[in-house]
Structures are given as structure tokens and as C-alpha cells.
Interface confidence: low
Amino acid sequence: MARGSVSDEEMMELREAFAKVDTDGNGYISFNELNDLFKAACLPLPGYRVREITENLMATGDLDQDGRISFDEFIKIFHGLKSTDVAKTFRKAINKKEGICAIGGTSEQSSVGTQHSYSEEEKYAFVNWINKALENDPDCRHVIPMNPNTNDLFNAVGDGIVLCKMINLSVPDTIDERTINKKKLTPFTIQENLNLALNSASAIGCHVVNIGAEDLKEGKPYLVLGLLWQVIKIGLFADIELSRNEALIALLREGESLEDLMKLSPEELLLRWANYHLENAGCNKIGNFSTDIKDSKAYYHLLEQVAPKGDEEGVPAVVIDMSGLREKDDIQRAECMLQQAERLGCRQFVTATDVVRGNPKLNLAFIANLFNRYPALHKPENQDIDWGALEGETREERTFRNWMNSLGVNPRVNHLYSDLSDALVIFQLYEKIKVPVDWNRVNKPPYPKLGGNMKKLENCNYAVELGKNQAKFSLVGIGGQDLNEGNRTLTLALIWQLMRRYTLNILEEIGGGQKVNDDIIVNWVNETLREAKKSSSISSFKDPKISTSLPVLDLIDAIQPGSINYDLLKTENLNDDEKLNNAKYAISMARKIGARVYALPEDLVEVNPKMVMTVFACLMGKGMKRV
């Protein structure tokens, strides 16, 4: 390696710096890692400036243009850019990152001592979105509308109600409204609402990183915006999924299978959707929602394409005024474009400045909202499509996916099987359950065009080997090929064992390292119920009595006496609706008293023993902490 005049001392600094930025330890710095570095370093820089610096570093540093910076390239950046502003800012960010790491919180889930800058643009965008979403909700009248130009938002989230409502808008029925404390709030009932919000956010797949109820109560901007973005994004992306929106099949390209389309992430589908309409308009395609949309021209043509044409009953035509395209000034052009978006009811998330600066997060939200309102796609007729392949994910699959995402796996899991086909997510889950992974044996993306699947298969083989030899899982008849090909039954068998071990590990940590198994949990449940003089008990996680949810509800009341309002429950001769009603209340109440429950109400009603086990284990963890 040509090291030029790098001293040994500087070399050491560079290696340390590189290791700090290369957070996934794969030996390369990615665009996201650079972005995260600047976020974590909380330099007093606006979001767009961070973006510019990151893009500049990637452009100048990534010499072989493979989308990542190697250690050699990293040295050249530092050397070649020593005197430039970009390099100075980069160095400052790296030095600051150390400072942040060195300051730890005192509470178990807090970020005490860390300072973070936050995006005014995001605050402005989210406030306007929430105001619109909750404008008619009587429970939010005490805070809505919020002023986007003040700190209203950070005060408004403090009692947990707005967060609970936004979670329910993103994934309906996540939280049972009966469990939200709404009147005469006290510090204790506020704490319950925040528990409910945080644990429910986790259950829908939000990565709730060292963020506790205290942080929300104090309205810490960086954490509040981070959580809200995840909640809003999950809602915006909910229908950008083939099995829930068959018209997306119109985006199939020549020679592509349905399976190929189903593997795309919501972001990739949105980009393809935008380009589909831009092609129809005879315009250039875009490759991102940042630099490529800065001039508003793509947006103009997209609006023109998706605007109602008057051919649908009850939907009047909207003719987009394209004259703003002639504006010389970018900001003016963006403003004219947004005025047209407003005519469609889609002026959301971005200001003209956000468009011109190419704010990737807010532009993504703008496009997603436009898609949800005006997809302008038609399910293709007479196409030779295997509609049977379009089945959506099962509840169990969704639960597993949400669990993984809440742990912060990277990349995010959008499609359970195809996103696990290279086992990278599985390796991260092994680390979460303290099974050491030899990352030198792991092939990392980008995979070569030729032989890429072989690399993925090698990873899958190693993942199965780790499961058998290190984790001591029961993986009889499971091979790497099954993970690689997305064999449902066999992949789920591994994922379940990962989730089970994760759950038991947490229990063992609370219990001072004592081993825990199903019998111990069942005994603890029955003992706790007996001590609290409750009449219910369970014989196993398959006990039919669990379908009423009464053992779960009694256990919650035993852990936190007086928490369950039994007047809301049906206790005898329950029909299916009444069972579901009890179960919804039980799952939300479990989260409200602080248990991070991923299971769904239906899991209780149907007595799904796997998920039932996780519910009781989480409650046991909560009950043991109390002691």
C-alpha cells in the first residue's frame, strides 16, 4: 500500500478512526456508516450539510467506485483532503464520536449525557403530518394542533397519548384504546402510557435504541424524532407491498418473475413506481430521492401522471399546471410544484427547501404519501401471473420480522425469507444471543454477479453450523441450502429457536444466570397466580384456558395489583369475538406494565404455544424485576 508520508503515530490514529466509523466491522465504510457517524457526532451542522459532506467524502474517497471506502482509500482521504473543510469536519466528527461513546447513561434505557443535534426540517414535517392525522381525535385536543415552529412536539409526546395514537394509525389495532390513560394523568399513569407506546413501537418493528420513558417525558428531540420517523415510515410503507397491493404487479419488467418483484424493499418499489410513471411521461428516470429530484422536474411529471383524469366515478379530474417548470430559480420551481401537490392534498413532509436540498428522508416520505393517495396503477389483465404466489406473510412471520427489526438488524428485514438468504441478519441475531460469529468466515455484500449466490450459500452453511455447534439448536434436517432458498418451515424453525433463546437469555440475566425452561416459567406463573389468590392457572403453553386470556390478565394483575379493569372483560362462555376482545386488552396491558411482548392477540385466542411462551416469559421477566 502506498502510504506516502503517513507516520506510524498517524497510522495508529487512522486505524482507530477507521474502526470507529466501520461500525459493522466488515472492513469497509459504507455511505450509511458515514451518515451515522455525523449524526452521532452531533456537530452543529444542518442535515443538508451533513449530506453534502458525506456525498463529497464518498465521491472523493471511494476511488474504485464500489460504493464503499476501504482502509487504503480512507488513508488517502485523510491525506488528500487534510486542509479541506470536509476533511476537518470528518476528523471533528470522528473525535466527537469518541466523546459521545465515553458518556454513558445512568438509567437502564436512557441516553443521559449524550447530546445530539436534530433536524428542524424533520420536526416541521412531522408536526404538520401529526396535526393532520390527529386533527379530529378528541383525546388529543389538549395538544393538537402543535406549532411546527416551536418545541410543541417535544412537549406533546410527554404523556404518551400522541405516540400511542400514531402507532395505531401506522399499524391499526396495535394498541387497545381501553388501555391508554387519557384523563387526570399522574406521573404514574404517564409512565404507563410511555411504556405502552415504547413496547408497542417495538412490537411493530421499531428499533427503540437506548430510549426510555424518561427520554420521552423529557422530550429529547433527537430520540423523539427518531422514534416518530420509524412509526411514520412503517405506516407510509404498509401498503407498498405486493401481497397487499396487487396493482404493483404493473411494475414488473420484461423477463422478471413475480418473485423478483416481491424481493424489492418498499424504497425500491417506490423508486420503480416513480420511474414507471416518468417513463410513461417520456422523461428521464431517477436513481434516488435526493440529488435526482432537486430541480423538481421529476416531481412535476410524476404529479401530472398520477393526478386523477376524471375517468373514475366520484373523483374529479385535477389538471396539473406545469407552467412552474419554466421558473429559473430552483426554490421557486419547487414551491410552484408543491402548490400543485397541494391541489392533490399531498403537500406533506417537504418544503421547497427540502426538495432543493434533496433531503432523502423527507422526500421519501413525500413520495410514499403520494403513492398511497394516487398510485395510478392498474392490475394487469390477461397476464400470465401466478396469483397464488402472492400470499401475504403469516402473523407468525410478521412477528418474527418485527422482532428482528426491533433489535436493529441491518439491513432491515422487509421480506422474511428473501432477506435472510445470505444469512447476514442471522449472524447479527446470533450475536444478540451471545453466540460468537467469526466474521472472517462471512462473505459480505456487494456479492459478485457471477458466483454471488455461492457466497450467500457459504454464509448459510456457516449459519447452520453455528446453530448446531455453538448455539446447540435442534436443526435436524436443516442445511444452508434451506435458508438460502427460503424454505419456510425450516427457516422458521431456526428463527423460532433464535427468538426463544433471546427471550430466555433476558430471563436468565434477570435471574442471576439461572437456567430457565418451559417448566420453570409455567411453575412461576402458577405460583405467582396462587400467591395473588387468583383462580386461574395453566398446565402448559398449550392449555386451552389460555384462549380466554384470563390467565394472562390475572398474571398482569398479580404483577401490578389493580391494573386490570375486570369490568371490561368477559369471563364465562366466551365466543370468538369476546376472546379476541380479552386478548387485545391482555397484550396491550402486558406492554403497559412494561413487558416487551411481540405476540399478537390472535396468538392467545388460538393458543399458539410458541408465542404464548414468549408472553409468559416476558411477564415473568417483568415480575422478577419487581421482586
Epitope: A19, K20, D22, T23, D24, G25, N26, G27, E98, C101, A102, I103, G104, G105, E108, Q109, S111, G113, T114, H207, V208, V209, N210, L407, G408, E431, K432, K434, V437, D438, W439, N440, V442, I506
Partner: nanobody
Framework: QVQLQESGGGLVQPGGSLRLSCAAS????????MGWYRQAPGKQREMVAI???????YYGDFVKGRFTASRDDAKNTWNLEMTNLKPEDTAVYYC???????????????WGQGTQVTVSR
């Protein structure tokens, strides 16, 4: 309170080998980047090896293939296998790690007290 404790230092002849270990104690969930550093009398502290959380390892230029760093995250212990030692390797060797005490918690910047390694006839 998290603590790191090095062990395995001592007196060794040139060309000999030593195995340093570092054990973390206290409430630990996981360790991110960990490293070995050394400081010779009158000199600045220098990096010996860094193991990033993904397992990617970096070595100081003077190592030249003589040392091997490894980590056992299940036991929260880290080792530095040193072979073909030279008199200029004489120094106090320190263990360092960024440690999380809870799942997804903040990273604590943690140093050990150091262990003396002397390479001499």
C-alpha cells in the same frame, strides 16, 4: 461498574512467546470495538491491535504478523497471542473496549489497568 483486567504479562526472553488475556467483569451485555495498546517508558501509548465488533482486526505496523488478537464474546474475554518477542516490545500492555451494559444501551469507553511485559535476556 464495568472493569477490565489484564493478565499474562511477565518476563520473557527475546524470541519467546506470551499470551495476554483481558477479562471484563461487572454488568456487561456486549462489547463493541476492543483493542490492545501498549506504552513503553517515555513513549506515547500506541495501538497494538483492534478487533471491531464485526470481527475485522487491525494491527500496528510493528506487529508484522507476530501477534494475533482474538475475542470470545460469550465469555467477555479477549486474548493477545504474542510470538517472536523483541526487546523493543517491552511495555505496559493495556486492554480497551467499548462496552454496553444493556441491550442497545450506550457504549462505555473502558480501559484496563495494564500488565507489564518485559523482553530481556
Amino acid at each position: 461498574q464495568v472493569q477490565l483486567q489484564e493478565s499474562g504479562g511477565g518476563l520473557v526472553q527475546p524470541g519467546g512467546s506470551l499470551r495476554l488475556s483481558c477479562a471484563a467483569s461487572g454488568s456487561i451485555f456486549s462489547a463493541s470495538t476492543m483493542g490492545w495498546y501498549r506504552q513503553a517508558p517515555g513513549k506515547q501509548r500506541e495501538m497494538v491491535a483492534i478487533i471491531a465488533s464485526g470481527g475485522f482486526t487491525y494491527y500496528g505496523d510493528f506487529v508484522k504478523g507476530r501477534f494475533t488478537a482474538s475475542r470470545d464474546d460469550a465469555k467477555n474475554t479477549w486474548n493477545l497471542e504474542m510470538t517472536n518477542l523483541k526487546p523493543e516490545d517491552t511495555a505496559v500492555y493495556y486492554c480497551h473496549a467499548f462496552i454496553r451494559t444493556v441491550v442497545d444501551g450506550p457504549l462505555y469507553n473502558t480501559w484496563g489497568q495494564g500488565t507489564q511485559v518485559t523482553v530481556s535476556r
